[in-house]
């Protein structure tokens, strides 16, 4: 299996944005790579987002995706937006080398993303 590295812990910003790098130890230069972000919480695994990209081009997620990303060599910089406290969980990076063959699969150990909802601003009387 292909080795995939990602940070153990990331804290989302007060605006609910979390970014992390997913690095894969490719055996060479795949021309087509698929990156999937999975969320594991309470032993349930759900797909957060996925993108297939041609090496050297930008990652393209679906228009309604909460993810954006850029790639550089064997690194993918992923950003997840619109996170709330209930979205805290383990976010796993899955990388697939789709072309040329053979197919390679790598799954990271996951990044624990902590999301803290901001305190509402108290009303102020003037």
């Amino acid at each position: 299996a292909m080795h995939v590295a990602q940070p153990a812990v990331v804290l989302a910003s007060s605006r609910g944005i979390a970014s992390f790098v997913c690095e894969y130890a490719s055996p060479g230069k795949a021309t087509e790579v698929r990156v999937t972000v999975l969320r594991q919480a309470d032993s349930q695994v759900t797909e957060v987002c996925a993108a297939t990209y041609m090496m050297g081009n930008e990652l393209t997620f679906l228009d309604d995706s909460i993810c954006t990303g850029t790639s550089s060599g064997n690194q993918v910089n992923l950003t997840i937006q619109g996170l709330r406290a209930m979205d805290t969980g383990l976010y796993i990076c899955k990388v697939e080398l789709m072309y040329p063959p053979p197919y390679y699969l790598g799954i990271g150990n996951g990044t624990q993303i902590y999301v803290i909802d901001p305190e509402p601003c108290p009303d102020s009387d003037f």
């Epitope: 060479g28 063959p101 053979p102």
Partner: antibody, heavy 118, light 107 residues
């Protein structure tokens, strides 16, 4: 376990064409990867010669391109190197090796020594 | 072609020593660098790929680092079986190229 095994004549006369074969076991050469020839001059470093891909595509080192042909026999799971107009400078140990596209070489043959001499 | 300049060309060391071999690429090759070990009469064996990842079964005393143009192979504590020739290899751009090798000898 993937294994590669080179075979060839050992001795070739100058100006002749060298022919070497690499027999692959444990993996089909049409299923994936790129199948390469690399040589090592006596006491020297390694020189990549070229590849034939799982799909039959070729790419050769520009420094040798005019003299090199790499082909395959899928029924025997073999690929071959032909190097024309050889000179003493082609005396070397020739290795076959496997890699992912533009990748490092994970499996190698044990090498076959080729001497060019009259 | 990308030149891989390896140094030193030879090195004498003792069992237990820490040894560092360097390789400089003539242009940026990202992290697409591998290291091989070769013993006389044998084929090279992969040690490190993608700059810093150990190939399956390679002992943890072997490590790699670098990016761009400068790369290093380190053997943290030499063992008797480590005396061999080491080659770096760039696989960023065809034609694929190798360093000239570093012969590691017993002092």
């Amino acid at each position: 376990q993937v294994q590669l095994q080179e075979s060839g004549p050992g001795l070739v006369k100058p100006s002749q064409t060298l022919s070497l074969t690499c027999t692959v076991s444990g993996y089909s050469i049409t299923s994936g990867y790129y199948w390469n020839w690399i040589r090592q001059h006596p006491g020297k470093g390694l020189e990549w010669i070229g590849y034939i891909g799982y799909d039959g595509s070729n790419y050769y080192n520009p420094s040798l391109k005019s003299r090199v042909t790499i082909s395959r026999d899928t029924s025997k799971n073999q690929f071959s190197l032909k190097l024309s107009s050889v000179t003493a400078a082609d005396t070397a140990v020739y290795f076959c090796a496997r890699n992912y596209y533009s990748g490092y070489f994970d499996f190698w043959g044990q090498g076959t020594t080729l001497t060019v001499s009259s | 072609d990308i030149q891989m300049t390896q140094s030193p060309s030879s090195l004498s060391a003792s069992v237990g020593d820490r040894v560092t071999i360097t390789c400089r690429a003539s242009q940026n090759v990202g992290t697409y660098v591998a290291w091989y070990q070769q013993k006389p009469g044998k084929a090279p064996k992969p040690l490190i790929y993608s700059t810093s990842y150990r190939y399956s079964g390679v002992p943890s005393r072997f490590s790699g680092s670098g990016s761009g143009t400068d790369f290093t192979l380190t053997i943290s504590s030499l063992q008797p079986e480590d005396f061999a020739t080491y080659f770096c290899h760039q696989y960023d751009t065809y034609p694929l190229t190798f360093g000239a090798g570093t012969k590691l000898e017993l002092k």
